[in-house]
């Protein structure tokens, strides 16, 4: 016969799970802030840049009170997946000038991927319905010039910073309701 069954698996404390997710999100927010500052130092922005393919900011700070955990986690995961795709695109197609932001951009990508896995785990631990697999997103066109890569980087890091800031606030608020 096989080995004796182990002790029954204790369901982890969802507040502790949420805590570790908040820590990861905070850490990624700090990384993003630092990389955005590095980008500004090397390539000062010549405008307030945005990119149509980026997700719109999920929620204003004032509307945080109405949030529900499933909705927040599902939306956060979808938005961060989009940012992961954009960071990958930036590293691949952003041009030689953005190579000066390595290895930090690579580290950011790895930590973003780690946070996404943590969110997936949290959703399954909380027995939240798993969202359907994302439809394949249309490929992002490469920037038309070196300046295009720089402006895209400003847009992506700026948007990711706002999203993560929103995520930290939202997750902390939801923790108090668990």
């Amino acid at each position: 016969p096989g080995p004796p069954p182990g002790p029954p698996r204790v369901s982890p404390d969802p507040r502790a799970e949420l805590d570790s997710t908040v820590l990861l999100t905070r850490s990624l927010l700090a990384d993003t802030r630092q990389l955005a500052a590095q980008l500004r130092d090397k390539f000062p922005a010549d405008g307030d840049h945005n990119l149509d393919s980026l997700p719109t900011l999920a929620m204003s700070a004032g509307a945080l009170g109405a949030l529900q955990l499933p909705g927040v986690l599902t939306r956060l995961r979808a938005d961060l997946l989009s940012y992961l795709r954009h960071v990958q695109w930036l590293r691949r197609a952003g041009g030689s000038s953005l190579k000066t932001l390595e290895p930090e951009l690579g580290t950011l990508q790895a930590r973003l991927d780690r946070l996404l896995r943590r969110l997936q785990l949290l959703m399954s631990r909380l027995a939240l319905p798993q969202p359907p697999p994302d439809p394949p997103a249309p490929p992002l066109a490469p920037p038309s010039s070196a300046w295009g890569g720089i402006r895209a980087a400003h847009a992506i890091l700026g948007g990711l910073h706002l999203t993560l800031d929103w995520a930290v606030r939202g997750l902390l608020l939801l923790k108090t309701r668990l």
């Epitope: 130092d41 090397k42 390539f43 000062p44 922005a45 010549d46 405008g47 307030d48 840049h49 945005n50 990119l51 000038s97 000066t100 038309s144 010039s145 070196a146 300046w147 295009g148 402006r151 895209a152 400003h154 847009a155």
Partner: antibody
Framework: EVKLLESGGGLVQPGGSLKLSCAAS????????MSWVRQAPGKGLEWIGQ????????NYTPSLKDKFIISRDNAKNTLYLQMSEVRSEDTALYYC??????????WGQGTSVTVSS | DIVLTQSPASLAVSLGQRATISCRAS??????????MHWYQQKPGQPPKLLIY???NLESGIPARFSGSGSRTDFTLTINPVEADDVATYYC?????????FGSGTKLEIK
């Protein structure tokens, strides 16, 4: 107040070289893109090129790329334009300028370069 | 390179009237939520002075008589009403792509 003071211009023979300088003051030089723009007598403005704060990205107008070299020394708050193989069509007033959130928003008074034998 | 075509080459306007200068780009200068078209004024013996940045933003210290509009390839600088001090040459410039380029200039005179 932003101040940009170009120097180094003068008379140079065809085929010769010249190095222009632009001394910057009144702002944090190391946080700005810097540009060179020239203007031939009685003509319009021609963008020469630009350099980012840490010199990792330098762009030129293609026709001048092999003749001109843009550089900067952040410790000295100075922008440079090294000109080589000059010809009569390089006779112009050479301006240095900042480039940033408000486009090319500060210009020097210019330094005059005359190419003649 | 992006070619900027300015028109007219020269313009004579009565004091108090409206002056309109056009700048057409050979390809779009819009990207990342901005129109990278700027307008400068240059008086004889002086360096250029920024009037309008990114198509429609008035530079600090510039009178509200100056305004800019347009997107993609077609842009306009309007001066209304024209004053004697506005006699100058006006240039458009695109900074969407390297090399940045200038229009050929429009000389404004008083009728």
């Amino acid at each position: 107040e932003v101040k940009l003071l170009e120097s180094g211009g003068g008379l140079v023979q065809p085929g010769g070289s010249l190095k222009l300088s632009c001394a910057a003051s009144g702002f944090d030089f190391r946080r700005y893109w810097m540009s060179w723009v020239r203007q031939a007598p009685g003509k319009g403005l021609e963008w020469i090129g630009q350099i980012n704060p840490d010199s990792s990205m330098i762009n030129y107008t293609p026709s001048l790329k092999d003749k001109f070299i843009i550089s900067r020394d952040n410790a000295k708050n100075t922008l440079y334009l090294q000109m080589s193989e000059v010809r009569s069509e390089d006779t112009a007033l050479y301006y240095c300028a900042t480039y940033g959130h408000h486009a090319t928003d500060s210009w020097g008074q210019g330094t005059s370069v005359t190419v003649s034998s | 390179d992006i070619v900027l075509t300015q028109s007219p080459a020269s313009l004579a306007v009565s004091l108090g009237q409206r002056a309109t200068i056009s700048c057409r780009a050979s390809e779009s200068v819009d990207s990342y939520g901005n129109s990278f078209m700027h307008w400068y004024q240059q008086k004889p013996g002086q360096p250029p002075k920024l009037l309008i940045y990114r198509a429609s933003n008035l530079e600090s210290g510039i009178p509200a008589r100056f305004s800019g509009s347009g997107s993609r390839t077609d842009f306009t600088l309007t001066i209304n009403p024209v004053e004697a001090d506005d006699v100058a040459t006006y240039y458009c410039q695109q900074s969407n792509e390297d090399p940045f380029t200038f229009g050929s200039g429009t000389k404004l005179e008083i009728k």
